[in-house]
Amino acid sequence: GQFRVIGPGYPIRALVGDEAELPCRISPGKNATGMEVGWYRSPFSRVVHLYRNGKDQDAEQAPEYRGRTELLKETISEGKVTLRIQNVRFSDEGGYTCFFRDHSYQEEAAMELKVEDPFYWVNPG
């Protein structure tokens, strides 16, 4: 059946060295355990994280994300997942696309990650 993919409607903000969490879900909610689910940065070959066959498929990841991502899938049976990026870098800033694909249908949603310097402080006065 068909579905929509919904990401956050606002930029996700994270500090350098911290964690960022990018949520993504399908609507109407349905079990996504058997789907191919992932995040990529354009072009598609820059894979941030890929999940299929009930497992994270680390071999497909772009080298700069290896060992730094985790898919939170406790609610994947409801069609909800979150990508956690650890040890955030300035180079992680920018656009991300989350996609869900089943055997007959694929949809995706774009989202943005803003990375900020924890040591940069502007005097409000």
Epitope: E36, P43, F44, N53, A59
Partner: antibody
């Protein structure tokens, strides 16, 4: 309508080379992994190789690793299989198959009609 | 590599019969299994994926079941068009796949 049309098969001597092509239409070619599956005369199906939608990841059966190379040209909607150091046991009908996934190997929802490769002296 | 074993190799049946084909995996593959039908001189056709999901356009007399290591393809009422060879395929391995040796369904 999805269509896959293989070409390039024929008779080749042992140790020789051949390049198979598969022209695809009716779907967004670059969004799907593609595979080659072969079937020796009177035998069952054997998966040979696969390639991700972008072409960035390739996968091979042990029986052809180091001898066969899969590639794709997404601007031409075409899949290729370069076969080197051919052996008699490579004789088969070679099918091009569309996968449902973007990466790796899943199940194949569309198949070409096949092209026959005969390796014989 | 995961080995797939089908039984029987050949099955003789009549139109209207209920037909069951079994596929066993050498290790657990969860529900990552597909079934195909192939007629002589033709390409295989996908019938079932994820062990029990019917591919679009496939008649409802075909059904699949099972998980782990044992799977079945059932044709509830065999039709003349169903005489063919059937293959199972494991899709658990992600970066490779293997097929069963095939089951030929012939006219009794």
């Amino acid at each position: 309508e999805v269509q896959l049309l293989e070409s390039g098969g024929g008779l080749v001597q042992p140790g020789g080379s051949l390049r198979l092509s598969c022209a695809a239409s009716g779907f967004t070619f670059s969004s799907y992994a593609m595979s080659w599956v072969r079937q020796a005369p009177g035998k069952g199906l054997e998966w040979v190789s696969a390639i991700s939608g972008s072409g960035g990841s390739t996968y091979y059966a042990d029986s052809v690793k180091g001898r066969f190379t899969i590639s794709r040209d997404n601007s031409k909607n075409t899949l290729y299989l370069q076969m080197n150091s051919l052996r008699a046991e490579d004789t088969a009908v070679y099918y091009c198959a569309k996968d449902w996934v973007y990466f790796g190997v899943g199940s194949f929802d569309y198949w070409g009609q096949g092209t026959l490769v005969t390796v014989s002296s | 590599d995961i080995q797939m074993t089908q039984s029987p190799s050949t099955l003789s049946a009549s139109v209207g019969d209920r037909v069951t084909i079994t596929c066993r995996a050498s290790q657990s593959i969860s529900s990552w299994l597909a079934w195909y039908q192939q007629k002589p001189g033709k390409a295989p056709k996908l019938l079932i994926y994820d062990a029990s999901s019917l591919e679009s356009g496939v008649p409802s007399r075909f059904s699949g079941s099972g998980s782990g290591t044992e799977f079945t393809l059932t044709i509830s009422s065999l039709q003349p068009d169903d005489f063919a060879t059937y293959y199972c395929q494991q899709t658990h391995s992600y970066s490779s796949t293997t097929f069963g040796q095939g089951t030929k369904v012939e006219i009794k």
